[in-house]
Amino acid sequence: SLLPVPYTEAASLSTGSTVTIKGRPLACFLNEPYLQVDFHTEMKEESDIVFHFQVCFGRRVVMNSREYGAWKQQVESKNMPFQDGQEFELSISVLPDKYQVMVNGQSSYTFDHRIKPEAVKMVQVWRDISLTKFNVSYLKR
Amino acid sequence: SLLPVPYTEAASLSTGSTVTIKGRPLACFLNEPYLQVDFHTEMKEESDIVFHFQVCFGRRVVMNSREYGAWKQQVESKNMPFQDGQEFELSISVLPDKYQVMVNGQSSYTFDHRIKPEAVKMVQVWRDISLTKFNVSYLKR
């Protein structure tokens, strides 16, 4: 069954945590649907964003942070492992110095920590996708 | 009650027709939600687009056409009559030489016909909105 989109969940992250998302683009790539995953510093959607991950399907991925209300330096990738019309599995792992983003089991993007991952309080998944799975796994100490 | 998004409906347009849409952005303007309305030449979403109207709430509006699979010259407007968090009523009227877009009763955008409005077979409303009303009215002859 489908999860609501935008999908918002409280989360605490640290090194070893992984966020897993399964979904499908709602439109063909020609129409440039988007997927966005935002790691927020508060439960409010207007809060700062520790890690902003936005896919324009078929075109590009941009990653950024929003600090004290201002977007910072954008990182862009043309790598496009997503398939038109196909379900995807996205996993974002918290490594000691960066986020590692896997798409369908393949390491596809990295983003250096700009803010401590421990500052994350909420994850939001939204834009032009249907969502079937959202999970945050924690490394067992 | 809410209509599904993306929302797709068969439509035939000509001078005097009006498409009316009521909805609400799904996110605060700081997060730049989008609204998109596309007038297609076929019932298929990958078909050409006679009139493409895309709002990046709080930032800008772009209008364009997609002909034989290729986007043409984009028209951009910084006019932003939409209100953060507020419901909007959008009406797109087919005038003899252009589309006129009204937002909450106020004339806000125009777009010259590049393709005959009679070529429209389907309207799609999508992206980051909840949709409560969609209507196509036809001028009584």
């Epitope: 510093t41 910072k72 330096q73 110095d97 250096d112 700009r114 803010i115 401590k116 500052a119 | -």
Partner: antibody, heavy 124, light 107 residues
Framework: QVQLVESGGGLVQPGGSLRLSCAAS????????MSWVRQAPGKGLEWVST????????SYVDSVKGRFTISRDNAKNTLYLQMNSLKPEDTAVYYC?????????????????WGKGTLVTVSS | NFMLTQPSAVSVSLGQTARITCQGG??????ANWYQQKPGQAPVLVIY???ERPSGIPERFSGSSSGDTATLTISGAQAEDESDYYC??????????FGGGTHLAVL
């Protein structure tokens, strides 16, 4: 052992210019962001500027914006600081520093290697 | 821009524990780093990422942070630890900031 060796300091009149250089060795220079930090006589440390590993992104303390330019030549393993419109308050020892870790544009993990510094004196 | 505030001087008896604080940073978000500087020498990184020690730094140096305060702790202070200590913080995309420095006297 990582080495950072600054040069180019000296006495200059107010309004004058200087170009500092920092020769780096014994590490992969092109992989790390680099910074300049200064210390006025008898005072504390003040961060001046940072440049990312590729040289495409720079950041400056407000007091030097528009007057100082940080740059790097990865082929020569050298960091530069072009200082124009110098003021007496720019008088300091200028240290070249390497960022800790592989972060692309950051001093957030600290600066793990420092040069011995070069003295810049701005006086008439 | 934020300002980092340190006490100008801290004294500790030989073999006792010294704590130097650094206030004013958003240490819930950004890491604290600490440097030791002896007279006439360049600074040396002694703690990074709040609590990590570079190789070669004695175990008696440790760090922590909470809220707007970072703390450098020297357990069993030695005579050679008498130095100036500076905290530093900053984000990836913005300015780095140093505290004003603290002189540690070992009595």
């Amino acid at each position: 052992q990582v080495q950072l060796v600054e040069s180019g300091g000296g006495l200059v009149q107010p309004g004058g210019s200087l170009r500092l250089s920092c020769a780096a060795s014994e590490f992969t220079f092109s992989r790390y962001s680099m910074s300049w930090v200064r210390q006025a006589p008898g005072k504390g440390l003040e961060w001046v500027s940072t440049i990312n590993s590729g040289g495409g992104s720079t950041s400056y303390v407000d007091s030097v914006k528009g007057r100082f330019t940080i740059s790097r030549d990865n082929a020569k393993n050298t960091l530069y600081l072009q200082m124009n419109s110098l003021k007496p308050e720019d008088t300091a020892v200028y240290y070249c520093t390497k960022s800790q870790g592989g972060i692309s544009f950051s001093t957030q993990y600290g600066m793990d290697y420092w040069g011995k510094g070069t003295l810049v004196t701005v006086s008439s | 821009n934020f300002m980092l505030t340190q006490p100008s001087a801290v004294s500790v008896s030989l073999g006792q524990t010294a704590r130097i604080t650094c206030q004013g940073g958003n240490f819930g978000r950004y890491y604290a780093n600490w440097y030791q500087q002896k007279p006439g020498q360049a600074p040396v990184l002694v703690i990074y990422k709040d609590s990590e020690r570079p190789s070669g730094i004695p175990e008696r140096f440790s760090g922590s942070s909470s809220g707007d305060t970072a703390t450098l702790t020297i357990s069993g202070a030695q005579a050679e630890d008498e130095s100036d200590y500076y905290c530093q913080s900053g984000s990836v995309s913005d300015n780095a900031v140093f505290g004003g420095g603290t002189h540690l006297a070992v009595l």
